[in-house]
């Protein structure tokens, strides 16, 4: 008989570079056998991982794997940092590798032209 644990598939040193102001979905790939486990996201802060209980999350089900998604709508500069997803399974807690978000604040980088500017001066798209 094959073992049937809940599994979390975030690889070592997983990272994403994203822009503040954009929407972003952080995915935790989860594999389970029968009952979908309770999965949560937390953000590393010093030696603790602080649960993100008030954030929008959702599930995306695919054929061989499911994804527990943390939504950033939009990404904020202070979303920069490392996150883990964790699952409770038969009274065991399993925690993923950390995944790091590197947030670029577009205001502090080269000023991004506004939508109005883009419409009136489309060449800005190509500079």
């Amino acid at each position: 008989k094959e073992s049937c644990d809940v599994q979390l598939y975030i690889k070592r040193q997983s990272e994403h570079s994203i822009l503040a102001g954009d929407p972003f979905e952080l995915e935790c790939p989860v594999k389970y056998c029968a009952n979908r486990p309770h999965v949560t996201w937390c953000k590393l802060n010093g030696t603790t991982c602080v649960k993100l209980e008030d954030r929008q999350t959702s599930w995306k089900e695919e054929k061989n794997i499911s994804f527990f998604i943390l939504h950033f709508e939009p990404v904020l500069p202070n979303d920069n940092g490392s996150y883990r997803c964790s699952a409770n399974f038969q009274s065991n807690l399993i925690e993923s590798h950390s995944t790091t978000l590197y947030v670029t604040d577009v205001k502090s980088a080269s000023e991004r032209p506004s939508k109005d500017e883009m419409a009136s001066r489309p060449w800005l798209l190509y500079r």
Epitope: Q7, R12, H97
Partner: antibody, heavy 118, light 106 residues
């Protein structure tokens, strides 16, 4: 129950290549990553590399040019190939399963002893 | 790659003693540290993961602690069957092991 079993040639001539098979039971290779670790006689453990559920691989950077890891999910087998062996590659070679979160190795095979000698 | 410096290399203790082994990582590894026990002629066995979580079936005399770069493994009351080599391992980046601590019982 979960088991891993390594099988290898035992003796390899210097400059030749090494092929070891890890046959697993009690779990599926579509659900767990598998690592390769070696241990020279009387010494410590060295991680060689691993294969993920999707078939992607990670290697020890110092050995990357000499290593390849593959698997056959249907046969529940993982394969280690190492090229250009030298005497300091003499070791016991283990395969070990990743924990469900990928953050430790929870089941190990008994290992297969490999001696590099002419 | 991250270097795990494990001390001491050898420990000679009496049954009933308390034993502490330390591992220092060359850079922060969060709590991505595991401890293994390897008895003579056997393969390694997982004892501790997430730096401080005891693996299934592991006696509670074995404990781990630490975060970042400094980690400790303790056997509160050594028993004769604890004769083994103990290894720490980081799994934050490509896995690396400490050099091992050989525990011998007087």
């Amino acid at each position: 129950q979960v088991q891993l079993k390594e099988s290898g040639p035992g003796l390899v001539a210097p400059s030749q290549s090494l092929s070891i098979t890890c046959t697993v039971s009690g779990f599926s290779l579509t659900g767990y990553g598998v690592n390769w670790v070696r241990q020279p006689p009387g010494k410590g453990l060295e991680w060689l590399g691993m294969i993920w559920i999707d078939g992607s691989t990670d290697y020890n950077s110092a050995l990357k040019s000499r290593l390849s890891i593959n698997k056959d999910n249907s046969k529940s087998q993982v394969f280690l190939k190492m090229n250009s062996l030298q005497t300091d590659d003499t070791a016991r070679y283990y395969c070990a399963r990743d924990r469900p979160d990928g953050r430790a190795m929870d089941y190990w095979g008994q290992g297969t002893s490999v001696t590099v000698s002419s | 790659s991250i270097v795990m410096t494990q001390t001491p290399k050898f420990l000679l203790v009496s049954a009933g003693d308390r034993v502490t082994i330390t591992c220092k990582a060359s850079q922060s590894v969060s709590n991505d540290v595991a401890w293994y026990q390897q008895k003579p002629g056997q393969s390694p066995k997982l004892l501790i993961y997430y730096a401080s979580n005891r693996y299934t079936g592991v006696p509670d005399r074995f404990t781990g602690s630490g975060y970042g770069t400094d980690f400790t493994f303790t056997i509160s009351t050594v028993q004769a069957e604890d004769l083994a080599v103990y290894f720490c391992q980081q799994d934050y980046s490509s896995p690396t092991f400490g050099g091992g601590t050989k525990l011998e019982i007087k």
